[in-house]
Structures are given as structure tokens and as C-alpha cells.
Interface confidence: low
């Protein structure tokens, strides 16, 4: 027998420093959890204990706080680097400044192999890239060799920006041939390492004859056996078993995300590369790992940057910007309307000729709008007065969801209107009325969303059977301020970028910006 | 501080069985190995084997394959290991011993059972 | 298996010397190795994981060194507490095999 101790993450977005407890900004250092100086700690402790350990991450590094915005993926290739992963799987985030934004920081600076199988690239890009990510690679793991193959969410292309040279094929169709290949190389014992979905992930250890393990993220799935450590709730055992089409028990694990936890999978193989058995469980990263003092170090240097970024001036207003509850938790406000106009801005993808774009709409509790931004300051916006904006450090997903969902949500925005409640929902690409001299649950008169199938985009009165995509808050595609109807009836979701970025990115770009209230929610007459 | 509680003394009569407990509480049981070590008397260690309390996955030293059988109850936080047909052979000092992430150093030890297979 | 053996099963030595207790592997075990101390009443502690690295608690006079199959611990200032069996283990491949033990006494 042979035993290999496989170390995840996935969906680190950017969290390069410690973190509070529910990954936002640490603020008690005592209670604070992640961060790589910590995950160093404990990936050496491992390494210097177990003979066979691999340390691998299943995508999405990128997107998430200022680190990225600031130093563009050259951070995550330097922390990766220093920790010395193994391989990582591409993730969509991986895309979001672009293929150059991928290429120049990360594939041409990474020292370890980038992963992606199901990704092909065409035209001139083709041989830019070629060699700079691959769809497989042997690792040797002590008097051993292990096939890693990658996979990536062929959904990529209407999450981040990819680009028109390259191509996401099915995740199955394209892993099959490249495990074949690895098969005839003698290697028989092989992780599929990837950034799909738990629901993808499970699919994979079932239908790809020759996969052993697989290595999942984008769904950040918290897998865990026995009491969990902290807040997060299991979605299944770890690790989770995926009985195979050809009759084979496949363990299946994902790591939650924000580096919170470091995976930990022990895998014991038989001399024909059959799994035996395989266990573990996440090992929650908190204060009692102590942060490894080297990297600090350079965690502090690299900061440095950050402190001056955060004042500088991102773009202008000539306008006041209200997002003060008075407003915004009661009627339409233009900080809810600027918000909203970045969350679509950031979502243009024209990945099909019928549509303008994939995505119109979009809400956002009011309540998640914390400070206005006063014009007469020079009109100056910095990433430091956006962060008074939107403090909690969220993120901007897609999520799908039916009409009659929707038109729940827009009832629920003003079930208990005039309180002063967060659920109040700002919004971009709908036009709503309310009527509040009607009964909670039936004050939505009107409600009229704007055209995706259209060359000229205009507003038509919602179906309640038809699907439809919404740029919202994390906050609300989890159910939060009540909208638990979003939660539970959400047909998708896809987790988007860092809630500051969209908006400091969309302002950088307008350069000066003066957003209007301009009748997309309205009262009708006799009830405000 | 971690401690591995387990009986004193077991006296047990040749063929019979033997369950061994030890009981493992003060941390998160489910995420470590508890490890079964014997030592007859005058002699060294000899690891039987082990076994993941968060996933009842267990290794066993090929010698002891049928000698012994590890399980784990978690709503007690107390691993077994039971012993059968047992022959003058297997009296000896059983010590459990936990081990777990990142280092498989059996860093806390049981006082060790003394099983005496006597008629 | 991986064979380990402590070719000295037992060894005389004065307080306050520096003792060296050695252990061989059949193979290579590349550095995974743990020194572990049972008292005279039976009592096991580990001592020492992967060749040098000490474990909480253990006096920094213990210290481990070795590559390859030959690894050593030594107690740079023998105390009278110290007097034990000490047994090294490896951990390269399953199963777990320990040396014999090298028994201390003191002079």
C-alpha cells in the first residue's frame, strides 16, 4: 500500500492576509483565522511529518479584496510560489482582468503547473499561450508518480472575461481523452483537480473512467465529518464518496473558500493504483496555527502598496452620492442606481449575437448601502470612501432565478414598509411599483424588466414562469435581510467579484460620474 | 491537556475475546488517529495498527489482521480495539496512542491495558 | 516492512554526559522519524518527530539528527529523570515499525 496526503484550497479570492471569522477584514488578531503565513505553517508542519503530501488548489485565487485589485494576480503567483503549491486548477476568476491579466502575472511567473483541460485555445492566442497552462501533469510524490488533470466551468465565458480565443468544452467530454492518455503513460493514480461545482465535481468521479480523487471548487462546498470546528455547515461528509459507473468508491472533497480551512485528504492506494481507502477532514486554519514569521514579513512589505492605494483618487462626482438609510432604506437613491449600473456594467459579455448581453437586472438591499459620498470634497472618490460604501466585504454573484421568485423578493422589499429595514431593495433594469395601500404580500402594482433578447433594450412586464438572470449581493442569493425566497427557489449561483471592485472599477472607467434618482421605483399616487 | 484513558487490567481466559477501550476526550476526536501499540512483557513496541475516528478508516499491521478489530464510537469520543481467540502469546501491554495532523508522531499515549490470558 | 534497528539494547552513562543513542532502517525512510521515551513505569512520551523537530514540552536538551537509513537522538546533559528505554520509529511506509529500544542507565 501507498499512502498520499493531499492538501486543498480553492476559492482563496484574494484573502492573502488573516481574516475575521466570516472572511472579512480581520479586526481581533486573536480571533482571526487563514491567511497564507498561516497556511504555511501548517502545510510545513504536514510536509515535514508525512512522506507524500501534494498541495494543490482548485482555482479562483483572483478577485476578492484589494490585494488583487491592486497588484493584479502578481501576488498570487509570489505567495503560491513561496508556499510551494504543486498545481492549481484555472477557476473563471482567473479571467477577470482578461487572458493577459492570466498570462503576464500568473502563467509566466507560477513556478508550479496551471491546470485546465477543457480549456483550448484558438487563433493567435494559441501559440501565445501554448505550454503556459496544460491539461495534465505527473507529478513525482516520493518513489511515485500522480496524474493531475484540470478542468474549469465551461460557464466561464458569462462569469469573467476569457476573451474569443478560447474555447470551454464539457468538463467530462474533455477530461476523458487526456485520463486515457495518462492511463497509457502507466500512470494509475490520478486526481481531477477543478473548478466546476460540487454538482460537477460529483458528476466527474462518476462518469470519467480512471479518475481516483477529485479536487473541486466554485461552489465552496464545506465538507466535513464528525462536530464542524466553526460556523459553516456541512454539505455532506468529507471526503464525499461518489460511487463510479464502472462500480469504483471515488472520494470527492472542496475545501469551503477564503482559505479558512486547508483541505486535508489521506488516500491509501494498492500497488495498481486503486484507492483503498481515503479520509480526513478540513483543518480549520485559527489562531492557535501561529502565522509563519518569513511570510509575514513579506505579507507586511507587500501592504505597503495597499495603505497608499487606498486613498488614491479613483474617479469623480459631481454629484452627492446618498446612500444614507433615510433614502435609501425608503425610495429609490442614486448611490442604490450607481451600485446597480456598475454590478450590470461589470457583467457586459456578448457571448451570443441575440442577446445585448447575457444579464439586465439587478437588486440590492438598501440596508447593505452603509455612507453617502459628499461631491464637495473635489468630487475626490477613493477605494477608502467606497469601503465606508460597502463595508462587509461581499461580492456581486449571478444567480437565476423564475419571475414569480422575483416578484416574491419586490413584495418582500416592502412587506413592512417605513421602518427603516434593510430589505428595501434598490434596482437596475427594473422599473417596480408599489401600491402601499394595499396588503403586505400584494403591494407590487407593477413590475417591468428590461429586454436581454433584443437589440434595443426596453422594458417588458415580468413572466412568472420565465427564467431569468439577476446581479445581486452575496448577501441576498444566501437569503439574507429575509429574502429567504431567493435562497431557496434560485435555479444557479455564481459566486461574482469583490462588491468594492465592481464599483471602484466601473468609477475608474467613467472617470466622473453623476448617477440620477430617475423613477425606477415608484409609489402609486395616494399611497406615499 | 490530552489525555487517553484506558483500564488498568483485563484477565481473560485462553480463545475468549477482548474489547479494549480508550476513551479520548479534551479535543475534536472525529479529526485524529487513534493508533493500538503492544508490548508483551520485556519486549518492545509493536504498532497493531490504527484507526480515523472521523471516518471509522483503519490500517491494520498485516501481523494482527486477524488478530484484532478497531472501531471507533464517537458519540463517546472512545476508540476499541477487540482482540480474539486469544493464546498466552497475546498477553502483553496494550497502549493506545493519538496521532494526527501532520505528524503521525503518536503524540499522546494511554497508560496501556495489561491483558493476562491465563486459565 | 521497514526493519529499524537500535543496535545498543542497552547503555551505562554518568549524569551530566552526552549520550548518543543510535537507530538503522532497512531503507531509505527519508527523515520520517520520531524518537519516543517510556519511563520505568511504563509511561510513553514522544520526544522527537521527523528526524529533529521536538515536541512541545521536551526539554531542548534532546535533540535528533540523521538522513537516509541512519538517524540519532542525543541528550546533550543527562539528568536523572531522563532514565528510560527510548525507541525510534519510522513512519515512511505503512506499517509503522519500531527499533528494539536502547535501554539507559545510569553509572
Known amino acids: 500500500a501507498w499512502e498520499l496526503t493531499i492538501l486543498h484550497t480553492n476559492d482563496v479570492h484574494s484573502r492573502l492576509e488573516q481574516t475575521s471569522e466570516d472572511s472579512s477584514k480581520c479586526v481581533n488578531a486573536s480571533r482571526c483565522m487563514g491567511g497564507v503565513a498561516r497556511l504555511f505553517t501548517k502545510v510545513q508542519q504536514i510536509r515535514r511529518a508525512e512522506p507524500n503530501v501534494l498541495l494543490l488548489d482548485a482555482g479562483d485565487q483572483y478577485q476578492g479584496t484589494i490585494w488583487f485589485t491592486v497588484y493584479k494576480g502578481a501576488e498570487v503567483a509570489h505567495f503560491m510560489n513561496a508556499l510551494r503549491y504543486d498545481a492549481m486548477a484555472l477557476g473563471n476568476h482567473e479571467f477577470d482582468n482578461g487572458v493577459e491579466g492570466l498570462i503576464e502575472p500568473l502563467l509566466k511567473e507560477a513556478k508550479f503547473p496551471i491546470l485546465s483541460a477543457n480549456i483550448k485555445a484558438k487563433g493567435p492566442l494559441a501559440s501565445q499561450i501554448s505550454g503556459l497552462y496544460l491539461p495534465y501533469k505527473v507529478l513525482p510524490v516520493g518513489d511515485e508518480v500522480v496524474g493531475i488533470v484540470g478542468y474549469t466551468s465551461k460557464e466561464t465565458p458569462f462569469l469573467s472575461n476569457p476573451g474569443t480565443n478560447l474555447v470551454f468544452e464539457d468538463e467530462i467530454t474533455a477530461l476523458q481523452p487526456e485520463v486515457d492518455k495518462l492511463k497509457t503513460l502507466n500512470v494509475n493514480k490520478i486526481i481531477a483537480l477543478g473548478h466546476s461545482g460540487f454538482e460537477m465535481d460529483k458528476l466527474i468521479a462518476q462518469k470519467v473512467r480512471g479518475v481516483d480523487v477529485v479536487v473541486g471548487g466554485h461552489s465552496n462546498t464545506f465538507l466535513y465529518t464528525g462536530n464542524p470546528p466553526s460556523k459553516e455547515v456541512p454539505a455532506g461528509k468529507y471526503p464525499f464518496i461518489v460511487t463510479s459507473d464502472d462500480g469504483r468508491k471515488v472520494p470527492v472533497v472542496q475545501a469551503y473558500a477564503f482559505g479558512k480551512y486547508l483541505g486535508y485528504l489521506k488516500i491509501e492506494f494498492d500497488e495498481r493504483g486503486n484507492v483503498i481507502s481515503s479520509h480526513g477532514n478540513p483543518i480549520l486554519l485559527n489562531s492557535s496555527i501561529p502565522e509563519d514569521p518569513s511570510i509575514k514579513a513579506d505579507i507586511n512589505k507587500w501592504r505597503i502598496k495597499l495603505d497608499n492605494y487606498s486613498t488614491q483618487e479613483l474617479g469623480k462626482t459631481i454629484v452627492y452620492l446618498d446612500g444614507s438609510s433615510q433614502s435609501c432604506r425608503f425610495r429609490e437613491c442614486n448611490m442604490g442606481n450607481l451600485i446597480c449600473d456598475a454590478m450590470i456594467n461589470n457583467n457586459l459579455r456578448h457571448t451570443d449575437e441575440m442577446f445585448w448581453n447575457h444579464v439586465s437586472m439587478c437588486i440590492l438591499n438598501g440596508g447593505g448601502i452603509r455612507s453617502p459620498i459628499d461631491e464637495r470634497n473635489n468630487g475626490t472618490i477613493t477605494w477608502e470612501n467606497l469601503a465606508a460604501v460597502l463595508p462587509f466585504g461581499g461580492t456581486f454573484d449571478l444567480v437565476q432565478l423564475k419571475g414569480s421568485t422575483l416578484k416574491k423578493a419586490f413584495e418582500h422589499s416592502v412587506h413592512r414598509y417605513g421602518q427603516s429595514t434593510g430589505e428595501f431593495l434598490q434596482v437596475g433594469g427594473i422599473h417596480v411599483v408599489y401600491d402601499l395601500s394595499r396588503k403586505p404580500g400584494d403591494r407590487v402594482v407593477k413590475l417591468d424588466v428590461l429586454c436581454t433578447k433584443c437589440r434595443v433594450p426596453s422594458y417588458d412586464p415580468l413572466k412568472m414562469d420565465e427564467v431569468y438572470k439577476v446581479i445581486l449581493p452575496n448577501f441576498l442569493a444566501n437569503g439574507g435581510d429575509g429574502f429567504q425566497m431567493i435562497k431557496d427557489e434560485l435555479l444557479r449561483h455564481d459566486s461574482g467579484d469583490q462588491d468594492i471592485n465592481v464599483v471602484s472599477t466601473y468609477i475608474s472607467k467613467m472617470k466622473v460620474i453623476y448617477p440620477a434618482v430617475e423613477g425606477r421605483i415608484k409609489f402609486s399616487t395616494g399611497s406615499h | 491537556q490530552v489525555q487517553l484513558q484506558q483500564p488498568g487490567a483485563e484477565l481473560v481466559k485462553p480463545g475468549a475475546s477482548v474489547k479494549l477501550s480508550c476513551k479520548a476526550p479534551?479535543?475534536?476526536?472525529?479529526?485524529?488517529?487513534i493508533n493500538w501499540v503492544k508490548q508483551r512483557p520485556g519486549q518492545g513496541l509493536e504498532w497493531i495498527g490504527n484507526i480515523y475516528a472521523g471516518s471509522s478508516s483503519s490500517n491494520y499491521n498485516e501481523k494482527f489482521k486477524s488478530k484484532a478489530t478497531l472501531t471507533v464510537d464517537t458519540s463517546s469520543s472512545t476508540a476499541y480495539m477487540q482482540l480474539s481467540s486469544l493464546t498466552s502469546d497475546d498477553s502483553a501491554v496494550y497502549y493506545c496512542?493519538?496521532?494526527?495532523?501532520?505528524?503521525?508522531?503518536?503524540?499522546?499515549w494511554g497508560q496501556g491495558t495489561l491483558v493476562t490470558v491465563s486459565a | 516492512d521497514i526493519q529499524m534497528t537500535q543496535t545498543t539494547s542497552s547503555l551505562s552513562a554518568s549524569l551530566g554526559d552526552r549520550v548518543t543513542i543510535s537507530c538503522s532502517a532497512s531503507q531509505g525512510i527519508s527523515n520520517y522519524l520520531n524518537w519516543y521515551q517510556q519511563k520505568p513505569d511504563g509511561t510513553v512520551k514522544l520526544l522527537i518527530y521527523?528526524?529533529?523537530s521536538l515536541h512541545s514540552g521536551v526539554p531542548s536538551r534532546f535533540s535528533g539528527s540523521g538522513s537516509g537509513t541512519d538517524y540519532s537522538l542525543t541528550i546533550s546533559n543527562l539528568e536523572p529523570e531522563d532514565i528510560a528505554t527510548y525507541y525510534c520509529?519510522?513512519?515512511?511506509?505503512?506499517?509503522?515499525?519500531f527499533g528494539g529500544g536502547t535501554k539507559l542507565e545510569i553509572k
Open positions: 479534551g479535543y475534536t476526536f472525529t479529526s485524529y488517529w
Open positions: 520509529q519510522q513512519y515512511s511506509k505503512l506499517p509503522r515499525t
Open positions: 521527523y528526524t529533529s
Open positions: 496512542a493519538r496521532s494526527g495532523h501532520g505528524y503521525d508522531g503518536f503524540a499522546y
